[in-house]
Interface confidence: low
């Protein structure tokens, strides 16, 4: 992710006796929560690898960059960061690797400047549809988020709710159309089998979409047509077999796009002909000379760019009387 890093040193460590500060009282200007490090010059608070079980109540009002990584937060309740006065400057919030399994509706409310949120490496079995929108209104107030990092948030199989994980994540992304301003979305390493067709159409401002290291088999029902600002599309390390004409045309029509397709099990049969022709002509695919066939066996490791139409055949379908088991 590209979450900002602190540019200043001079971090002050907190004294343990400050841990019980009340969130309703304005924190002292130089106060730093227990188990955290603070730099007012860098507007940064780091509470990293401290096994915290809840968000500190006494965060300093100056904080712009908050790192709460490597903790044991388990649940983010509604208003987890609501303070008096509000954390009006908080722009970047990193909660990665903090054992979150539930993020409730309105967890990020009252953070008017929150631009970058990283929830990666948390086993999110229960992500409320209103985690980012804050309300169940059909159209919510726009979220200030422009960068949302959700890499590796898939919970273990036995902890998943009895519903589609893809559907749960997409519901949170689309609720109330609050994330219309989202520019970067990272969803890598989430075992996604498919991409719900609505998700991209309702995130028209995306510049960067990372879907790498999932299990996507096809993009047939996914439309990229309206993503005119899209600059990078990461589809490496999925289960893609072929890209069909409709998808190829849509990608080619995006004015600034770069597509990354490495390490997919491309099936080099007659259905691949259009994609091979397109690859030879297009400049949008980065590292296209590295793409190789995985199937059928006779084509394994052949470079897609080196194939011609004679190489791409489909075995004839035998009449039933000649088929064998």
């Amino acid at each position: 992710s590209s979450s900002p890093t602190s540019s200043a040193s001079s971090f002050s460590s907190s004294a343990p006796f400050l841990a019980s500060a009340v969130s309703a009282q304005p924190p002292l200007p130089d106060q730093c929560p227990a188990l955290c490090e603070c730099s007012e010059a860098a507007r940064t608070v780091k509470c990293v690898n401290r096994n915290l079980t809840e968000v500190p109540t006494d965060l300093p009002a100056y904080v712009r960059n908050l790192f709460l990584t490597g903790n044991q937060l388990a649940v983010l309740p509604a208003g987890a960061f609501a303070r008096r006065p509000p954390l009006a400057e908080l722009a970047a919030l990193n909660l990665s690797g903090s054992r979150l399994d539930e993020v409730r509706a309105g967890a990020f409310e009252h953070l008017p400047s929150l631009r970058q949120l990283d929830l990666s490496h948390n086993p999110l079995a229960d992500l409320s549809p209103f985690a980012f929108s804050g309300s169940n209104a059909s159209v919510s107030a726009p979220s200030p988020l422009v960068e949302l990092i959700l890499n590796h948030i898939v919970p273990p199989e036995d902890e998943r709710q009895n519903r589609s994980f893809e559907g749960m994540v997409v519901a949170a992304l689309l609720a109330g159309r609050a994330l219309q301003g989202l520019r970067r979305l990272e969803l890598a390493s989430n075992h996604f089998l498919y991409l719900p067709r609505d998700v991209l159409a309702q995130l028209p401002s995306l510049r960067h979409l990372d879907l790498s290291n999932n299990s996507l088999v096809s993009l047939t029902y996914v439309s990229f047509r309206n993503l005119t600002h899209l600059e990078s599309l990461h589809l490496e390390d999925n289960a893609l077999k072929v890209l069909h004409n409709g998808t190829l045309a849509e990608l080619q029509g995006l004015p600034h796009i770069r597509v990354f397709l490495d390490n997919n099990p491309w099936v080099c049969d007659c259905h691949m002909a259009d994609m091979v022709t397109w690859l030879k002509e297009t400049e949008v695919v980065q590292g296209k000379d590295r793409l190789t066939c995985a199937y059928p066996e006779k084509m394994r490791n052949r470079v897609l760019l080196e194939l011609n139409s004679a190489d791409l055949d489909c075995d004839p379908i035998l009449p039933p009387s000649l088929q064998t088991s």
Epitope: S2, S7, V146, G181, E231, S232, P255
Partner: antibody
Framework: DVQLQESGPGLVKPSQSLSLTCSVT?????????WNWIRQFPGNKLEWMGY???????NYNPSLKNRISITRDTSKNQFFLKLNSVTTEDTATYYC???????????WGQGTLVTVSA | DIVMTQSQKFMSTSVGDRVSVTCKAS??????VAWYQQKPGQSPKALIY???NRYSGVPDRFTGSGFGTDFTLTISNVQSEDLTEYFC?????????FGGGTNLEIK
């Protein structure tokens, strides 16, 4: 805080190339965001020229596409503007600016005046 | 290219007044508009983004509004330091384009 500082020759001869440097402190240009060049002509009209992003990719104003190049030196945390075949019409104050993920320019350099004259 | 038109090159106002600077886009740009203030000899400074969001540290007397093609920057209770030039910018599509600027002057 993020700071940007332009530098380069203040006088360039017609038909030559204009080269400017933007030095960034307080944030690594490879960590994120978009690093732009914008110029302001006498009379104060502003023109967006193009950017290089944190991945090293470019996007240029089509009106300049055949003449412009924006590159970077990540080891020095600098990015560069090169504008070829300049004419007197390229006389302007040149700014470098950081573009946020949602496209507007939050941080600007102080600007450097470049005059194109024989 | 999208043309951003600030029809009034100069506007007169007085300290304490309320003034509205307008900007018109040649086509629909949604809310993808920013406003900048530029004082003589300085670089532009961001005031408003996404048509109505105030940038951090900008006084709340500055407000932005508008959608589609018509946008307004309103300064209530004008201060002497506000008497300078203001630019709008669209970022709905490339190339990004700016308005020609509006100078606020003392009446």
């Amino acid at each position: 805080d993020v700071q940007l500082q332009e530098s380069g020759p203040g006088l360039v001869k017609p038909s030559q190339s204009l080269s400017l440097t933007c030095s960034v402190t307080g944030y690594s240009i490879t960590s994120g965001y978009y690093w732009n060049w914008i110029r302001q002509f006498p009379g104060n009209k502003l023109e967006w020229m193009g950017y290089i992003n944190s991945d090293g990719s470019n996007n240029y104003n089509p009106s300049l596409k055949n003449r412009i190049s924006i590159t970077r030196d990540t080891s020095k945390n600098q990015f560069f503007l090169k504008l070829n075949s300049v004419t007197t019409e390229d006389t302007a104050t040149y700014y470098c600016a950081r573009e946020e993920y949602d496209y507007w320019f939050a941080y600007w350099g102080q600007g450097t005046l470049v005059t194109v004259s024989a | 290219d999208i043309v951003m038109t600030q029809s009034q090159k100069f506007m007169s106002t007085s300290v304490g007044d309320r003034v509205s600077v307008t900007c018109k886009a040649s086509q629909n740009v949604g809310t993808n508009v920013a406003w900048y203030q530029q004082k003589p000899g300085q670089s532009p400074k961001a005031l408003i983004y996404s048509a109505s969001n105030r940038y951090s540290g900008v006084p709340d007397r500055f407000t932005g509004s508008g959608f589609g093609t018509d946008f307004t920057l309103t300064i209530s209770n004008v201060q002497s330091e506000d008497l300078t030039e203001y630019f709008c910018q669209q970022y709905n599509s490339y190339p990004y384009t700016f308005g020609g600027g509006t100078n606020l002057e003392i009446k």
